[in-house]
Interface confidence: low
């Protein structure tokens, strides 16, 4: 899928628009709100009933080149005891984050926008079981 | 920036870090995953700690529909069903990188933006804060 | 589930499971196996995008493996063992197996024996 053009008949094309080159983008990698922060609850990883973990994924041709992804730790979920009800099930809540993807061909370098699925944290659910015969 | 390994063949001139703008390539990869978590899943329902999906949208970002989750209740879903105050239910945030129109309107020219989500909730154990 | 019976410990079986039904984007199948009296144990599962997961007393004698066209999962083990002894049962769940299955639920297929004597 291409990124889609501004569909609105509303949305003139403005003149002071840079020139690009045909099946491209000019794509300004300095990121708005680069300083924002998280501000989830603390520690609801560990105080989570489907708590998670996390690994960092380094890749040194993406930017960023850092993204986190988080795994749950049991199957099923904690109990009010504190042991695990394999009644109910973690599972993972996934979300799609943009990319910038840097490829090396010889001695040109070309860029690529990339949707990545990160899994964010784990929520506990029934299961639904689709049994076989 | 990020250092990346260079080919030792090519001629220095090359930046090792990203540049500040770049040019894209207008086709995006993986760009076939399904962006409406309803139909991927209906965890949203299923939790124990449920949340609500709503739309927010704004032609001039991409992608341009991004669905935002909002707990249903302060508690969470016991067996019986019934919601338990002893526990709480917590969005998951996360931030995730979207393409803003850059000068605004333009079609094919766009900066990074950080934006704050929040992805779904997950039941937790209150942090309860005695006062003397 | 097929594909079960008794055989000699060292030898090999091969179990099947024909599945329908599930329509999630992300999914995840597997085996899991109970013995008399004991607790139900998670064997080998395998997610929609075909990574593999495995208990530890299988790894490296059984391999989950599955035929998308005919919509089958199967679990060839070798190197069978007295312990492996158990009725086998496959399931499929929406969602991520890290680990594989050991579902809760008593709602399941018929499973198929297998018992290994030494």
């Known amino acids: 899928r291409k990124i889609p053009k501004v569909g609105h008949t509303f949305f003139q094309k403005p003149e002071s628009c840079p020139p690009v080159p045909g099946g491209s983008m000019k794509l300004d990698i300095g990121i708005i709100n680069e300083n924002q922060r998280v501000s989830m609850s603390r520690n609801i990883e560990s105080r989570s009933t489907s708590p998670w973990n996390y690994t960092v994924t380094w890749d040194p041709n993406r930017y960023p080149s850092e993204v986190v992804q988080a795994q749950c730790r049991n199957l099923g979920c904690i109990n009010a005891q504190g042991k695990e009800d394999i009644s109910m099930n973690s599972v993972p809540i996934q979300q799609e984050t943009l990319v910038v993807r840097r490829k090396h061909q010889g001695c040109s370098v070309s860029f690529q926008l990339e949707k990545v699925l990160v899994t964010v944290g784990c929520t506990c659910v029934t299961p639904v079981i689709h049994h076989v015969q | 920036g990020i250092t990346i390994p260079r080919n030792p063949g090519c001629p220095n001139s090359e930046d090792k870090n990203f540049p500040r703008t770049v040019m894209v390539n207008l086709n995006i990869h993986n760009r076939n995953t399904n962006t409406n978590p309803k139909r991927s899943s209906d965890y949203y329902n299923r939790s124990t700690s449920p949340w609500n999906l709503h739309r927010n949208e704004d032609p001039e970002r991409y992608p341009s529909v991004i669905w935002e989750a909002k707990c249903r209740h302060l508690g969470c879903i016991n067996a019986d069903g019934n919601v338990d105050y002893h526990m709480n239910s917590v969005p998951i945030q996360q931030e995730i990188l979207v393409l803003r129109r850059e000068p605004p309107h333009c079609p094919n020219s766009f900066r990074l933006e950080k934006i704050l989500v929040s992805v779904g909730c997950t039941c937790v154990t209150p942090i309860v804060h005695h006062v003397a | 589930e097929s594909g079960g019976g008794s055989v000699q410990a060292g030898g090999s079986l091969r179990l099947s499971c024909a599945a329908s039904?599930?329509?999630?984007?992300?999914?995840?199948m597997g085996w899991f196996r109970q013995a008399p009296g004991k607790e139900r144990e998670g064997v080998a599962a395998?997610?929609?995008?075909?990574?593999?997961t495995y208990t530890d007393s299988v790894k490296g004698r059984f391999t989950i493996s599955k035929d998308s066209a005919k919509n089958t999962l199967y679990l060839q083990m070798n190197s069978l063992k007295p312990e492996d002894t158990a009725m086998y049962y496959c399931?499929?769940?929406?969602?991520?197996?890290?680990?594989?299955?050991?579902?809760?639920?008593?709602?399941r297929g018929q499973g198929t024996q297998v018992t290994v004597s030494s």
């Open positions: 399931a499929i769940l929406d969602g991520y197996c890290y680990r594989p299955i050991r579902t809760g639920y008593h709602d």
């Open positions: 039904g599930y329509t999630y984007r992300s999914y995840c």
């Open positions: 395998m997610n929609s995008d075909g990574t593999t």
